[in-house]
């Protein structure tokens, strides 16, 4: 219980100003904690680098859609 209460929160304070090719992206996670100053997305690249991005930007939304589709149940 104490460990969960004191678990560190990852926040993004700055966003990348470069669009990242979806071919370089492996996964993402959303930062939704109210303890963080900004709503953010953290992309993990295929070389395991983590990059903060702005979820309001269309390329970020499109990249999340692309990664989501890779997890989807095959259509019959």
């Amino acid at each position: 219980q104490p460990d969960a209460i004191n678990a560190p929160v990852t926040c993004c304070y700055n966003f990348t100003n470069r669009k990242i090719s979806v071919q370089r992206l492996a996964s993402y996670r959303r930062i939704t904690s109210s303890k963080c100053p900004k709503e953010a997305v953290i992309f993990k690249t295929i070389v395991a680098k983590e990059i903060c991005a702005d979820p309001k930007q269309k390329w970020v939304q499109d990249s999340m859609d692309h990664l989501d589709k890779q997890t989807q149940t095959p259509k019959t």
Epitope: T32, V60, Q61, M64, D65, K69, T71, Q72
Partner: nanobody
Framework: EVQLVESGGGLVQAGGSLRLPCAAS????????MGWFRQAPEKEREFVAV????????FYSSSVKGRFTISRDNAKNTVYLQMNSLKPEDTAVYYC????????????????WGQGTQVTVSS
């Protein structure tokens, strides 16, 4: 936080139609994958439909495919579930959810949930 409010539920005869809107407020609506789930009495919550952020991709459970249509209007911060050819087995509480984490139809990848709207289909 994202707040989700479903409406449009009610009592309908088998073969009828309903449209369920879900209005979102709080954070950037267009940055969330949106889904509909349902829970019938004494049953587990089940996935119904999902739509991508752009609205360009959708996916349906086999039990509703061809009868239900999910759509979204990012300008109005609203997602819709159009339900046609309703059957008594569609009776359930319908929940709208916003998907923040990577995934597609898995309930665990949806961070925000509405309170639900009751749909009852009589025979």
């Amino acid at each position: 936080e994202v707040q989700l409010v479903e409406s449009g539920g009610g009592l309908v005869q088998a073969g009828g139609s309903l449209r369920l809107p879900c209005a979102a407020s709080g954070r950037t609506f267009s940055s969330y994958r949106m889904g509909w789930f349902r829970q019938a009495p004494e049953k587990e919550r089940e996935f119904v439909a999902v739509i991508s952020r752009s609205g360009g991709d959708t996916f349906y459970s086999s039990s509703v495919k061809g009868r239900f249509t999910i759509s979204r209007d990012n300008a109005k911060n609203t997602v819709y579930l159009q339900m046609n050819s309703l059957k008594p087995e569609d009776t359930a509480v319908y929940y709208c959810a916003a998907g923040a984490q990577m995934g597609w139809a898995e309930a665990s990848t949806y961070d925000y949930w509405g309170q639900g709207t009751q749909v009852t289909v009589s025979s």
